[in-house]
């Protein structure tokens, strides 16, 4: 399948560097509740050979573990294949490499199919600027406002950042 969004001007390399998770959304609320499999936080990203590499922070036992994941390119420019708690079709929905990134994933784990969206920003002080865009993308793909969780500093594993 293919999503008709455009990849960032200048290519994926512009996504490299530090990011901060601002909001999550899902049609299965348990996935993004504390200790949910998709309540994870971006630390940094890099791109190589068209693939996206991400370091994410996962809360575990009161601490945060850094895990490296790779989302592999597909024939569609904004779509990637990611193995994390099953198979994910990962789509870059809106990208401004200097400011914010909105992605969503269709997750298949055993016989269950779920939808998860993620808003991340470069500068946390500007997070409010991009929440309307996130709400708009979520609504468009079938996620409602009450399915969005806006993260706080405590949620984000801020203490685990280098």
């Amino acid at each position: 399948q293919e999503g008709n969004h455009e990849e960032p001007q200048g290519g994926l390399e512009e996504l490299s560097g530090r990011w901060h998770s601002v909001a999550l959304a899902s049609n299965k609320s348990d996935l993004i509740k504390p200790w949910g499999h998709f309540r994870v936080f971006i630390h940094s990203m890099s791109a190589k050979d068209g693939n996206l590499h991400g370091d994410i922070l996962i809360p575990q036992d009161g601490q945060c573990e850094k895990v490296s994941l790779t989302a592999f390119k597909t024939a569609t420019s904004n779509k990637f294949d990611l193995e994390y708690w099953g198979h994910n079709d990962l789509y870059l929905a809106e990208v401004d490499p200097k400011s914010y990134l909105i992605l969503y994933m269709i997750n298949q784990y055993n016989d269950d199919t779920s939808l998860v969206a993620h808003l991340m920003v470069r500068d946390l002080s500007r997070q409010q600027d991009f929440l309307p865009a996130f709400e708009s993308v979520c609504e468009d793909i079938g996620l409602h406002k009450d399915q969005i969780v806006v993260l706080s500093d405590d949620d984000r594993c801020q203490g685990s950042r280098d």
Epitope: Q1, E2, G3, N4, H5, N27, D89, A93, Y104, I106, Q108, T113, S114, L115, E139, D140, I141, G142, L143
Partner: nanobody, 124 residues
């Protein structure tokens, strides 16, 4: 729920084009992700294309990518499937489906309404 009625099917030759329509009535059309599926004789129903609620995003099965185009007109409560360069393997009954979200591409669980289907036959 919405009620869905497909039209536009028929018998065409390989290489020809066809445009399917699906008219919706009932609840607000723009609240739904819309999909086309198809079912060939003796085969399972398969995903063809989907379009997000506003029409901003479209999704296609690999087998139709570059040949088929899904679009929607929310004021008219209609979704379309433009099918170009048809091949014999496209022969099937084509179903319109409304879904709560885009997971309908991967799972029928998100589908809330189905149309009755329209037959497309591609001959050589």
């Amino acid at each position: 729920q919405v009620q869905l009625v497909e039209s536009g099917g028929g018998l065409v030759q390989a290489g020809d084009s066809l445009r399917l329509s699906c008219a919706a009535s009932g609840r607000s059309f723009s609240n739904y992700v819309m999909n086309w599926f198809r079912q060939a004789p003796g085969k399972e129903r398969e995903f063809v294309a989907a379009i997000s609620r506003s029409g901003r995003s479209t999704f296609y099965a690999d087998s139709v990518k570059g040949r088929f185009t899904i679009s929607r007109d929310n004021p008219k409560a209609t979704v379309y499937l433009q099918m170009n360069s048809l091949v014999i393997e496209d022969t099937a009954v084509y179903f319109c489906a409304a879904a709560s979200d885009i997971t309908s591409m991967r799972s029928l669980a998100a589908i809330t309404s189905w149309g009755q289907g329209t037959q497309v036959i591609v001959s050589s």
